[in-house]
Interface confidence: low
């Protein structure tokens, strides 16, 4: 599923991401834009052999199990395939664990490079939330 901007903002808000660990909803929508272009089925292979999955590009080395990443930790205790669902519940729940891990949203390279320090509220402007 490819979400619309405001559609995703509403879904993320419903799942409790707004101001989760101090990160406003705009940060999460911005991260999703530059990680996956709002596509729940986005996948990208990394040079270390791991793969990033889903709308927030969650990594199989640490967070989920795809059965194919050597030394996977699966800290979210989920199959990576769950992160490709049009239902973003699994991605959100895992993201909450990631953002609580110590580095906050710096764990997402795209957020660090494209969203951090910008007017992230622009990503939810005009949305009926």
């Amino acid at each position: 599923k490819v979400f619309g901007r405001c559609e995703l903002a509403a879904a993320m808000k419903r799942h409790g991401l707004d101001n989760y660990r101090g990160y406003s909803l705009g940060n999460w929508v911005c991260a999703a834009k530059f990680e996956s272009n709002f596509n729940t089925q986005a996948t990208n292979r990394n040079t270390d052999g791991s793969t990033d999955y889903g709308i927030l590009q969650i990594n199989s080395r640490w967070w989920c199990n795809d059965g194919r990443t050597p030394g996977s930790r699966n800290l979210c205790n989920i199959p990576c395939s769950a992160l490709l669902s049009s239902d973003i519940t699994a991605s959100v729940n895992c993201a909450k664990k990631i953002v609580s891990d110590g580095n906050g949203m710096n764990a997402w390279v795209a957020w660090r490079n494209r969203c951090k320090g910008t007017d992230v509220q622009a990503w939810i402007r005009g949305c009926r939330l």
Partner: antibody, heavy 116, light 107 residues
């Protein structure tokens, strides 16, 4: 139960292209990688590459880039591999398998013969 | 690419014998090594995953061991249905690679 059903044997002329199909049943097709493997007598098993049907992501063994092209149709739960510019070296049995790192489920194989 | 070398190429045994098949990787692959059996005109069948985990439905006479670069598939008291080709495969890195195979034949 999980099953992978491949298309039937093909006899093709050198220079032609062929498209092999692999229909999956018994699991959520879009969220598991489909792998393609080549087997020639005396050459063992060779990994050609893989596709994740739900996203269309593909990864190819460098050796088969330009030779193989993967596609998938999630509406029919079918993966396809097209082989182009066929030569006698492409004569082999081609398998699809469900990728979990290891390959627990395999198709029955499609025999391709390239002959003038 | 990781090269997998299987030995011996052919193993001639009598039913009831116990045998060991070897698979050696060109670099360390942890336990990311899987074993398959293949009979003529059939697809490969997964026997052992991750070096030592027997796949569901595989008889207990099959066992796997090893880590790093050296791996062994053992068959305790070979039965006639066990004859065929055995392949190892690594999932430590891409491209996935297979060993050249060991043929288990009746003496």
């Amino acid at each position: 139960q999980v099953q992978l059903q491949e298309s039937g044997a093909e006899v093709m002329k050198p220079g032609a292209s062929v498209k092999i199909s692999c229909k999956a049943t018994g699991y959520t097709f879009s969220t598991y990688w489909i792998e393609w493997v080549k087997q020639r007598p005396g050459h063992g098993l060779e990994w050609i590459g893989e596709i994740l049907p739900g996203s269309g992501s593909t990864y190819y063994n460098e050796k088969f880039k330009g030779k193989a092209t993967f596609t998938a149709d999630t509406s029919s739960n079918t993966a396809y591999m097209q082989l182009s510019s066929l030569t006698s070296e492409d004569s082999a049995v081609y398998y699809c398998a469900r990728g979990d790192g290891y390959y627990c489920y395999w198709g029955q194989g499609t025999t391709l013969t390239v002959s003038s | 690419d990781i090269e997998l070398t299987q030995s011996p190429a052919t193993l001639s045994v009598t039913p009831g014998d116990s045998v060991s098949l070897s698979c050696r990787a060109s670099q360390s692959i942890s336990n990311n090594l899987h074993w398959y059996q293949q009979k003529p005109h059939e697809s490969p069948r997964l026997l052992i995953k991750y070096a030592s985990q027997r796949q569901s439905g595989i008889p207990s006479r099959f066992s796997g061991s090893g880590s790093g670069t050296d791996f062994t598939l053992s068959i305790n008291s070979v039965e006639t249905e066990d004859f065929g080709m055995y392949f190892c495969q690594q999932s430590n890195s891409w491209p996935r690679t297979f060993g050249g195979g060991t043929k288990l034949e009746i003496k």
